[in-house]
Interface confidence: low
């Protein structure tokens, strides 16, 4: 039985050329976490592997930066880079555990931080 | 009951872009991972790429920039631009295939035949 | 990326043999392997997933076991219908994978 939740950051915003944190944090399990995900729509932007560390994604390692922790820092922010992310915990025995952000990239200065959400 | 079954040409000039359809019943793409696979004659397996159940798609090295993966509510789509002949398969969808019970069930699979 | 590596790549046995296959991974996939039946003009069939769990419908003559990089499938009486050829697949990651599946082992009539 998958008992854990995924808590994010929820709904966020950045300004252009700026950068943002992406977290996400498992709790209320014992499972293992063998490995995270971090995905945007249809992109794989960088994994965490227990075993093998980070991976970041060729297309992205210019703008992409493992951490804090098992987070995710995106770098030179543009407008295109609204959208959903993913971070999916596989863990073990559990199973999968997918967590979810929207981060919205302003040209003004105006950007505030959303409210924080939890997804079962 | 759960079925899959591909469908498309069985002919394909090289240098064009092969196009399969995988239409699905029983079950819902919106839960599942779907994968193509392909078997050239007298091979083994080999794996073409995987899309999500929310639509995250990942492809197989060898594949990258040739093919796309997408799909309907029920249908899953494969792309494979200029082919040629060593792109003569047996192409098969399955459901699954990361991180789940393996990939069951398969689809009889479609012959593919690059040739001018 | 992750290499598959099957062995033996054929084999010739007789009815009634106990037979064992195994598939090394180069990396830790924990127990995320699966391992597939294909008889000549078919399409593969499942018959292990997670290393050990038997698929539905899968006679109990096949097991797998194995964890990490080791996995092993064993046919513990070999029956006729059991001539074929049997893939593992790893399911651990499909992020730069040049491809998921072992090369395959052929087991044929002694």
């Known amino acids: 039985m998958m008992t854990g939740t995924i808590e994010t950051t929820g709904n966020i915003s950045a300004e252009k050329g700026g950068s943002i944190i992406l977290q996400c944090h498992l709790s209320s399990t014992t499972a293992q976490v063998t490995q995270v995900n971090w995905e945007q729509q249809d992109q794989l932007l960088a994994i965490c592997n227990a075993d093998l560390g980070w991976h970041i994604s060729p297309s992205f390692k210019d703008r992409v930066a493992p951490g804090p922790g098992l987070g995710l820092t995106l770098q030179s922010l543009t407008v295109n880079d609204t959208g959903e992310y993913f971070c999916i915990y596989h863990t073990y025995p559990d199973g999968t555990y997918t967590g979810r952000i929207f981060l919205e990239v302003l040209e003004s200065s105006v950007a505030e931080h959303g409210a924080r959400f939890q997804i079962p | 009951q759960v079925q899959l079954q591909e469908s498309g040409p069985g002919l394909v000039k090289p240098s064009e872009t092969l196009s399969l359809t995988c239409t699905v019943s029983g079950f819902s793409l919106s839960s599942s991972y779907m994968s193509w696979i392909r078997q050239p004659p007298g091979k083994g397996l080999e794996w073409i790429g995987i899309?999500?159940?929310?639509?995250n798609t990942y492809y197989a090295n060898w594949a990258k920039g040739r093919v796309t993966i997408s799909k309907t509510s029920t249908t899953v789509e494969l792309k494979l631009s200029s082919v040629t002949a060593a792109d003569t398969a047996v192409y098969y969808c399955a459901r699954g295939g990361y991180r789940t019970s393996g990939m069951d069930p398969w689809g009889q699979g479609t012959l593919v035949t690059v040739s001018s | 990326d992750i290499q598959m590596t099957q062995s033996p790549s054929s084999l010739s046995a007789s009815v009634g043999d106990r037979v064992t296959i195994t598939c090394q991974a180069s990396q830790n996939i924990y127990s995320d392997l699966a391992w597939y039946q294909q008889k000549p003009g078919k399409a593969p069939k499942l018959l292990i997933y997670r290393a050990s769990t038997l698929a539905s419908g899968v006679p109990s003559r096949f097991s797998g076991s194995g964890s990490g990089t080791d996995f092993t499938l064993t046919i513990s009486s070999l029956q006729p219908e059991d001539f074929a050829t049997y893939y593992c697949?790893?399911?651990?990651?499909?992020?730069?994978?040049?491809?998921?599946f072992g090369q395959g082992t052929k087991v044929e009539i002694k």
């Open positions: 899309i999500g159940s929310n639509g």
């Open positions: 697949q790893q399911e651990h990651l499909v992020a730069w994978i040049y491809n998921v």
